[in-house]
């Protein structure tokens, strides 16, 4: 955790690092370790990759224990093979508007992700890709007998775009906040980030929070009921304490986690909230970190690593933070 103790390195000479990850001396000058990458947790002993201009951002001067690897101010972003300057906005596809900020990319969907339930007016709603349109749009297949409510007016026209929500326009500032990114880990403690200008100075800033989609040790597939293919939100029987680089949460939490599927789908957070969690470290120091708490999960085929980088990127993001 810190450098006060003597140097103790693993028996094997040097770890093998994945491609593109630097082998560096740890922060104590003791052992060679694989450098932590952008968005990963870092400590004094686990340094960030200096060759990529990363530093360990501890968030506040009071907390010098655990930070997040962050790009230095003004660091560019590499996205889809293109380099973008910090502060630059770009449309990654017709469906997403993205912003680069100090090495981190935050994207906002330009298409509505709304859901439509059947009703007498729209008994068989379908989302379809219309020629010449980027976003899928709702189409209501009329029932066979044509006993549709309301007069049979000309085919309805879908609004193509919505202006900014007026409540989100402050004096000389169009408030924009990207979705929280998907958790950096599919199990165990990870990091989720977003970009926002929702602050007094209307300046773009990065925000990060801890996240845990599911514990790594849980064998969730065992709990899938016979005949079912997924367990969306498995029951966690007992309250748990979160662990973060040797520090333990002060309170216990009856947290919700996302389950698994046996048919190739993945289950990811759908609705989440962000709450502060206090961690107590062995030396008695207490630090406060924002953490994602899951309200509901969704199981879908838009899994990490799917063909369309933008689709899988967005669908793995949180559907929206609820207060």
């Amino acid at each position: 955790q810190n450098c006060s103790g003597p140097c103790r390195c693993p028996a094997e000479q040097a770890p093998r690092c994945p491609a593109g990850v630097s082998l560096v001396l740890d922060g104590c000058g003791c052992c060679r370790v694989c450098a932590k990458q952008l968005g990963e947790l870092c400590t004094e002993r686990d340094p960030c990759d200096p060759h990529k201009g990363l530093f360990c951002d501890f968030g506040s001067p009071a907390n010098r224990k655990i930070g997040v690897c962050t790009a230095k101010d003004g660091a560019p972003c590499i996205f889809g093979g293109t380099v973008y300057r910090s502060g630059e906005s770009f449309q990654s596809s017709c469906k997403y508007q993205c912003t680069c900020l100090d090495g981190a990319v935050g994207c906002m969907p330009l298409c509505s992700m709304d859901v439509r339930l059947p009703s007498p007016d729209c008994p068989f709603p379908r989302r379809v890709k219309l020629p010449g349109k980027c976003c899928e749009e709702w189409v209501c297949d009329e029932p066979k007998d044509q006993t549709v409510v309301g007069p049979a007016l000309a085919a309805y026209r879908l609004e193509d775009t919505f202006g900014p929500d007026p409540t989100m326009i402050r004096a000389n500032c169009l408030v924009q906040t990207t979705e929280w990114s998907a958790c950096s880990k599919t199990c165990g403690m990870g990091i989720s980030t977003r970009v926002t200008n929702d602050n007094a100075s209307c300046r773009l800033e990065k925000q990060s929070r801890l996240c845990m989609v599911r514990p790594c040790e849980a064998d969730l597939e065992e709990n899938i009921k016979k005949g079912k293919k997924c367990i969306r939100t498995p029951k966690i029987s007992k309250p748990i304490k979160f662990e973060l680089s040797g520090c333990t949460s002060v309170k216990t939490y009856r947290a919700k986690f996302c389950g698994v599927c046996t048919d190739g789908r993945c289950c990811t957070p759908h609705r989440t909230t962000t709450l502060p969690v206090e961690f107590k470290c062995p030396d008695g120091e207490v630090m406060k970190k924002n953490m994602m708490f899951i309200k509901t999960c969704a199981c879908h085929y838009n899994c990490p690593g799917d063909n369309d980088i933008f689709e899988s990127l967005y669908y793995r993001k949180m559907y929206g933070d609820m207060a």
Partner: antibody, heavy 114, light 110 residues
């Protein structure tokens, strides 16, 4: 984010006309209909009427002669008008999106009193 | 006049399963009635749970499910939680209008 918000007077005199506006965001009125529902104090829900995505309307038969619902799609607004108000019409009035009544406004409480 | 009837009140233990029903005075409930279920929380806020008999609204946990049981529409809550304590209303469509039931007050014991 889908939101609906009702606005209008909180106090109406008997025999007067009540006009409420439901302003929506996050969806288009040409894609979804909007219902009006009310809840008298301490009682259950009463469906009043709907304007569908294509402009047609349906009303609760008990209010047919007093009710009009219209919309301005470009302004994302639905207007609800109820004539000849009576003290028994005192209630919280809600607009809700068609399709499972999945999203509701926060409601506006209307008191009918002289 | 068509009347839609719900149980006035129901109680369930935490973790238990409860089924609320919705009966029509003019015959069996079918999918053509597009049964909707709406929750009113103690804070008076409404949210749709189920539309078109059995379709969950976005963000509604899969503990909530809608179906037709015999001649009635039904809302089943499995693994009941303390924050499920609310009023639940069903609404049925009758060709030209909806009718709401009187609502069920659900109490989660303990």
């Amino acid at each position: 984010e889908v939101t609906l918000k009702e606005s209008g007077p909180v106090l109406v005199k008997p025999t007067e006309t009540l006009t409420l506006t439901c302003t929506v965001s996050g969806f288009s009125l040409s894609t979804f209909g909007v219902h009006w529902i009310r809840q008298p104090p301490g009682k259950g829900l009463e469906w009043l009427g709907v304007i569908w995505r294509r402009g047609g309307t349906d009303y609760n038969a008990a209010f047919m002669s007093r009710l009009t619902i219209s919309k301005d799609t470009s302004k994302s607004q639905v207007v609800f008008t109820m004539t000849n108000m009576d003290p028994v019409d005192t209630a919280t009035y809600y607009c809700a999106r068609d399709g499972g009544f999945d999203y509701w406004g926060q409601g506006t409480t209307v008191t009918v009193s002289s | 006049e068509t009347v839609v009837t719900q149980e006035p009140s129901f109680s369930v233990s935490p973790g238990g399963t409860v089924t609320l029903t919705c009966r029509s005075s003019i015959g069996a409930v079918t999918t053509s009635n597009y049964a909707n279920w709406v929750q009113q929380t103690p804070g008076q806020a409404f949210r749709g749970l189920i539309g078109g008999t059995s379709n969950r609204a976005p963000g509604v946990p899969d503990r909530f499910s809608g179906s037709i049981l015999g001649n009635k529409a039904a809302l089943t809550i499995t693994g009941a939680q303390a924050d499920d304590e609310s009023d639940y209303y069903c609404a049925l469509w009758y060709s030209t209008h909806y009718v709401f039931g009187g609502g069920t007050k659900l109490t989660v014991l303990g």
